[in-house]
């Protein structure tokens, strides 16, 4: 099994153009893909959770926030390799002794079932079929999200899968 470089990556610099341009569209940037009202970036390379968080921030986005089981399923359906895992924006808050999303909200008991320890320095990743916790220092791929916005002359290919 060859390691997949990843499903999607991004170049958000504004001075790059597609060689075939189209009019303004509500669309995702190059390499990102639209999933309902979000643009998602599935990284190619790997990082510890904190670095992944920072990388999304540099791209004016955030690590993936999953609102419900349906969104989890939609996202997992885009992962076509069982062996690949992606950090999301959820980690364990030692002070509050609970899983906390990076937007400050806490995980509700019926949102996601996390396999693994809930302890200090635990962060959450998703695979094709499950949700796990792992040491935040582990290097993994990650998923960034941003809201769908108007992008001038930047049309993503129909599919990057």
């Amino acid at each position: 099994q060859k390691p997949s470089i990843g499903k999607c990556s991004v170049d958000i610099q504004q001075n790059r153009t597609k060689t075939t341009e189209r009019p303004d569209l509500l669309n995702c940037p190059i390499y990102w893909q639209q999933v309902q009202e979000k643009c998602l970036l599935f990284s190619h390379t790997v990082n510890p959770w904190n670095n992944s968080l920072a990388d999304c921030s540099t791209k004016e986005s955030s690590l993936l926030l999953i609102q419900d089981k349906d969104e989890l399923t939609r996202t997992q359906n885009l992962i076509h390799d069982k062996a690949i895992s992606f950090w999301i924006g959820l980690n364990f808050s030692l002070s509050e002794k609970n899983w906390k999303w990076i937007n400050g909200s806490f995980l509700s008991s019926n949102d996601l079932k996390i396999t693994g320890d809930a302890k200090e320095n635990s962060c959450v990743y998703i695979s094709q079929t499950s949700v796990y916790s792992e040491y935040c220092s582990t290097e993994m791929k990650w998923i960034c999200q941003k809201e769908l916005t108007l992008v001038r002359n930047k049309v993503s290919p129909d599919s990057w899968l």
Epitope: I5, S9, D11, T19, H44, T45, V46, N47, N51, D55
Partner: antibody
Framework: EVQLLESGGGLVQPGGSLRLSCAAS????????MSWVRQAPGKGLEWVSA????????YYADSVKGRFTISRDNSKNTLYLQMNSLRAEDTAVYYC??????????????WGRGTLVTVSS | DIQLTQSPSSVSASVGDRVTITCRAS??????LAWYQQKPGKAPKLLIY???FLQSGVPSRFSGSGSGTDFTLTISSLQPEDFATYYC?????????FGGGTKVEIK
Amino acid sequence: EVQLLESGGGLVQPGGSLRLSCAASGFTFGQYAMSWVRQAPGKGLEWVSAISAAGGTTYYADSVKGRFTISRDNSKNTLYLQMNSLRAEDTAVYYCAKPLDSSQWADFDLWGRGTLVTVSS
Amino acid sequence: DIQLTQSPSSVSASVGDRVTITCRASQGISSWLAWYQQKPGKAPKLLIYAASFLQSGVPSRFSGSGSGTDFTLTISSLQPEDFATYYCQQASVLPITFGGGTKVEIK
């Protein structure tokens, strides 16, 4: 100025060792995965090795696996390639290369000028 | 490993000519393909990434197309500075691989 500058090449006998360095400047080195790519005289490009931004994950071409080791020191903005058990077929110009985007391994938008490694007795 | 086969291996052309270089992958790579230009004694230069996106500063006479296994680099009107060797590179799975190169020579 955004640049990569390789050093450490030279003439070495078969079975010998060399350590290449690549000094980065003008961009946030620690945010990017980095690669080494080589080119034998008169031949095409061959990817050699890659390392993640934090340095914990490495990949190698089959042709160098077990002989070469890629590493990095983000505090020094420097990429390394330790080459052991060198063979004549390792003779090439070695380039370090940076990808376009910090989430990618490839699509190299920045290359060094290269350093020549010659393996000969 | 994914093999990339470039054709032709060399082409003779004149200034103003339209030049087309193809790159075929041994298996599907979606749009994960880049094109580079290299001149003698110099490092490669990124021209096109993600099959069809023009790198900043690259003249618009260069264009890329294709998806899956078949890709094309086109130079719409060859200029004197375009005489060089061109390589395709896949970024779908590791190891990263390059095509064998296409040398564009003066006719």
